[in-house]
């Protein structure tokens, strides 16, 4: 019997995702992997693919936390300067950024059914103890990039070594033994991101290797090129790697939502979260799990599927208008996506020129509001938040690289959907 569309959902790491929902997966030993995008497809499959960062054409690219790829500051015009990810050196072997490998002798308390899984990320080596599944066959095999050996055909996650190496999870089947999450769930705004899958993008092969892992404790340590061991922070019995954030768990109070701690090498730095003094609504509400009060999404003049209060706020975050213009001439399509900001009062326009599905030209311009008002053909398509715009621009950087070398039909249209703010199911953000 065919599953009704409305009932289709995806299960991934004990979490339900709606069809079309996008997120970055949480994978041990890395944590939240911003360089992998997952999407829940219409048939209930989880499709994940690795982000390919474009060469950044500026002198000093900026690494923005929670974004995978480096960005040019203030849409700097191009300079011919290629940026490449740092490789790692460990035990005399050089590993490329994103490469997974196995290490020996790192953990003294390693159990016989555990192995040490390491990965290279931006010049740092991240290693973790991985509990391997019980083997029920005589001749286990090694799988790419996993330190655990598995029985042929085992595992609920099947690998398709096709053109794009997409990794999938079967529809509506819970990955019951997926990685145990010892860290707090990041807020949805940080988890929802990325874009739809691209057959041409290489996936993080083996990133979801061990689908039958028991929920053993994962210890994460970082080793940089100077072989400094143990660059981690330990808080309340949990281990956090450099750059990771969490809300502290204090015995007397439980999880303190209004304090955010970050692991800085081995030192935890905690900051109080400051809530706004004034809210764009009369009666902001306190919601469990959130530090600050939130405005209940009052329905103002709405764009389809969106809820804003009367000052253009969505879930307490300011929204800005997004315009689009599509122009076709001589077999060439020029698509312009524009974001209007108040501070400064200007419009950022992203221009795509595509011929026969191949990206010919992509650039970003900033113009004054006065100039933008002169321009015809721009239609208001939605309002979005700065955080969604950041996700959009990151995705745009990826597909601008990808679509310049192969045919892209709907990638940009799919990406624009990231800007649409959906009304949250349970009435809160």
């Amino acid at each position: 019997e065919q599953v009704k569309h409305s009932e289709t959902y995806c299960m991934f790491q004990d979490k339900k995702y709606r069809v079309g929902e996008r997120w970055h997966p949480y994978l041990e030993p890395y944590g939240l992997v911003y360089c992998v995008n997952c999407i829940c497809s219409e048939n209930g499959n989880v499709l994940c693919s690795r982000v390919r960062c474009p060469n950044v054409h500026c002198l000093s690219p900026v690494h923005i936390p929670h974004l995978c790829c480096p960005r040019c500051p203030d849409s700097l015009p191009p300079v011919n300067n290629k940026v490449t990810s740092k490789s790692c050196e460990y035990n005399g072997t050089t590993y490329q950024h994103g490469e997974l490998f196995v290490a020996e002798g790192l953990f003294q308390n390693r159990q016989p059914n555990q192995c040490t899984q390491c990965s290279c990320s931006e010049g740092n080596v991240y290693c973790g103890l991985k509990t391997c599944p019980k083997l029920t066959c005589a001749f286990p095999v090694s799988v790419p990039d996993s330190c655990c050996r598995v029985c042929r055909g085992d595992g609920e996650l099947s690998w398709e070594h096709s053109d794009g190496d997409i990794f999938r999870q079967p529809a509506n089947r819970e990955a019951r033994h997926s990685y145990h999450r010892s860290h707090y769930d990041p807020p949805p705004s940080r988890q929802a991101g990325g874009l739809s899958r691209f057959p041409g993008a290489r996936s993080h092969r083996g990133a979801l290797m061990d689908s039958q892992q028991a929920s053993g404790t994962i210890v994460q340590i970082v080793i940089n090129n100077k072989h400094k061991h143990g660059q981690v922070c330990v808080s309340n019995g949990k281990t956090y790697s450099h750059g990771e954030s969490w809300h502290p768990n204090l015995r007397a109070f439980g999880i303190v939502e209004c304090v955010l701690c970050t692991c800085n090498v081995t030192k935890q730095e905690c900051k109080k979260i400051h809530c706004p003094n004034r809210y764009p609504c009369k009666y902001p509400q306190k919601i469990d799990g959130k530090c600050c009060k939130v405005c209940p999404g009052k329905k103002a003049k709405e764009l389809p599927g969106q809820s804003f209060d009367n000052k253009g706020y969505f879930c307490g975050e300011e929204t800005m208008p997004v315009y689009e213009s599509v122009f076709m001439e001589d077999g060439e399509t020029t698509r312009k996506i524009a974001l209007e900001t108040e501070r400064p009062p200007q419009v950022e326009v992203h221009v795509w020129t595509i011929r026969k599905g191949i990206l010919q030209h992509f650039h970003i311009e900033k113009i004054s509001k006065r100039m933008f008002e002169e321009l015809p053909h721009f239609k208001l398509v939605t309002r979005t938040t700065l955080s969604q715009w950041k996700i959009f621009t990151e995705g745009e950087a990826q597909i601008s690289q990808m679509c310049s070398s192969r045919v892209c039909r709907t990638e940009l249209e799919d990406l624009v959907k990231v800007l649409y703010l959906e009304r949250s199911e349970k009435g809160h953000c």
């Epitope: 849409s75 191009p78 001439e329 312009k336 400064p344 221009v351 311009e365 004054s368 006065r370 100039m371």
Partner: antibody, heavy 121, light 107 residues
Framework: QVQLQQPGTELVKPGASVKLSCKAS????????MHWVKQRPGQGLERIGN????????NYNEKFKNKATLTVDKSSSTAYMQLSSLTSEDSAVYYC??????????????WGQGTTLTVSS | DIQMTQSPASLAASVGETVTITCRAS??????LAWYQQKQGKSPQLLIY???TLEDGVPSRFSGSGSGTQYSMQINTMQPEDTATYFC?????????FGAGTKLELK
Amino acid sequence: QVQLQQPGTELVKPGASVKLSCKASGYTFTSYWMHWVKQRPGQGLERIGNINPSSGVANYNEKFKNKATLTVDKSSSTAYMQLSSLTSEDSAVYYCARSKSNYVAYYFDYWGQGTTLTVSS
Amino acid sequence: DIQMTQSPASLAASVGETVTITCRASENIYYSLAWYQQKQGKSPQLLIYHTNTLEDGVPSRFSGSGSGTQYSMQINTMQPEDTATYFCKQAYDVPPTFGAGTKLELK
């Protein structure tokens, strides 16, 4: 190839009006902004205004709002600029210029040869 | 309107020399800047747009750079045919405004 053709000279009396033309060829006339630029002898360049040939909507620099009127004739792919109440201050070279389509900022990639307007009695 | 201050007003350079012309905007123009070349008795020609993008057919000895309110154009080996007046133009706000021009002559 893209061409913007303008008459070389116009001689008119003070107080009169003149209609300068700019005939476009080699591209889709209605797809690109057309701008008009003034250059007085030995001086800099000033944009007078621009027109969207598709809709006929024109925008003017404040300074030229009561001086210039921009129009188009789509059938002949021609842009026009009418200058009224002419004085010696209006004696200048007037250029029509097209702006690039894949940029929103106005970058003038093709220019006419210019019409030298002389206002003299 | 945004004011564009161009300098120098004129200069003379020998063949092979490097020439730099600068332009200052009265406010941030976020890279929306173009450079035009106008030879005696001719109409202007677009050389560089969006701060540093060379228009098709423009020799690679021409280059542009800058950000915020400060921009410049460089000719890295002056040629006799580069004798002309050069104008910068901001395209960030309306109306687009030009600099007063720099007259470049051959020494």
